[in-house]
Interface confidence: low
């Protein structure tokens, strides 16, 4: 089964600033992936961003710059002032849908005891979950 | 061949249950996220949940959540819909659907609320 | 929740016509498009995906275009066992949801 994973950490220069990774270690191509936060997309998690391989790129306040690492895995930074600013619990989720194979998921937070930009480096990334 | 057969459907009265499944075969199940799309009568379709293909993550329109729960069993490639607390407009033709988009489709089952 | 609006509900045509179906999505859906033809108590089939793409199996007749609101299905030249009802499908979000249908019958 394909597999996602996700990464959040948080920046320590501005420590109300997040980024998360996602990747896909699936074979297809990847037709679409959501970052949403909160839960999954659809499941009482609020989209953040919507990356698109053709048409492009798409991010929702507090997102403030989402872009492709790889075909096959996203960053995004959040922007964290503001009564909508990520918390250290937040849960972040991605979604990579690649058809007609499927769509996977995963979900992830910043661990618990994370000292800002401490957090796992980036090989090998955690994979929280193949779903 | 792809194949994906529901059951359980019936009659049911206002305010009563039932549980559909869905049989899968011919793929591998557990890598799929799958669906329930219904079709009342003379009507056009309807999506009615999705579950993630590990069961972690499900969805569900407004019209149904707190309703209907959407559950798989992926050592036995079944999928479940769990409906509580039926009303008439939930009368429907029920699928079952592979992929997101629905690449592959049951024949449906058919569920009548009525008194 | 994102609304499809499809038109026409039906229409009339004759075999070999050319037919063309529009659905309008209530925002941008990028190109997250599918369109289904279901036939009189059958389930629905895929013909295409992610506004362009064939289906396994889906004639060459058939071919969707568009992007962002505004999408098609045309069918080049129509044959007999293509009388049915299309629907579009937006799968940019949840909840997945249908245009009401068009129903293309027999001129």
């Known amino acids: 089964t394909p597999e996602v994973w996700v990464q959040v950490r948080m920046e320590a220069t501005e420590l109300s600033s997040f980024t998360i990774r996602c990747g896909f270690l699936g074979s297809g191509s990847i037709s679409l992936v959501t970052v949403s936060w909160g839960g999954p997309n659809g499941a009482g998690g609020t989209t953040l961003a919507v990356l698109h391989p053709e048409r492009g790129i798409r991010q929702w306040a507090p997102a403030r710059q989402a872009r492709w690492e790889t075909q096959s895995s996203i960053s995004l930074i959040l922007e964290g002032s503001g009564a909508s600013s990520p918390c250290a619990n937040t849960t972040f989720c991605c979604k990579f849908a690649s058809f007609p194979e499927g769509s996977w998921e995963a979900c992830g937070s910043l661990p618990p005891s994370s000292d800002p930009g401490l957090s796992a480096p980036p090989t090998p990334a955690p994979i929280l979950r193949a779903d | 061949e792809v194949q994906l057969v529901e059951s359980g459907g019936g009659l049911v009265k206002p305010g009563g249950s039932l549980r559909l499944s869905c049989a899968a075969s011919?793929?591998?199940?557990?890598?799929?996220?799958i669906s329930w799309v219904r079709q009342a009568p003379g009507k056009g379709l309807e999506w009615v949940s999705e579950?993630?293909?590990?069961?972690?993550?499900?969805y569900y329109p407004d019209t149904v959540t707190g309703r209907f729960t959407i559950s798989r069993d992926n050592a036995k490639n079944t999928l479940y819909l769990q409906m509580s607390s039926l009303r008439a407009e939930d009368t429907a033709v029920y699928y079952c659907?592979?992929?997101?988009?629905?690449?592959?489709w049951g024949q449906g089952t058919l569920v009548t609320v009525s008194s | 929740d994102i609304q499809m609006t499809q038109s026409p509900s039906s229409l009339s045509a004759s075999v070999g016509d050319r037919v063309t179906i529009t659905c309008k999505a209530s925002?941008?859906?990028?190109?997250?498009v599918a369109w289904y033809q279901q036939k009189p108590g059958k389930a629905p089939k895929l013909l295409i995906y992610?506004?362009?793409y064939r289906f396994t199996g889906v004639p060459s007749r058939f071919s969707g275009s568009g992007s962002g609101t505004d999408f098609t299905l045309t069918i080049s030249s129509l044959q007999p066992e293509d009388f049915a009802t299309y629907y579009c499908?937006?799968?940019?979000?949840?909840?997945?949801?249908f245009g009401g249908g068009t129903k293309v019958e027999i001129k």
């Open positions: 659907a592979r992929g997101d988009p629905f690449g592959y």
């Open positions: 011919g793929f591998t199940f557990s890598s799929y996220g």
């Open positions: 579950i993630s293909s590990g069961g972690t993550y499900t």
């Open positions: 925002q941008d859906v990028m190109t997250a």
């Open positions: 992610s506004t362009s």
């Open positions: 499908q937006q799968h940019y979000s949840t909840p997945r949801t």
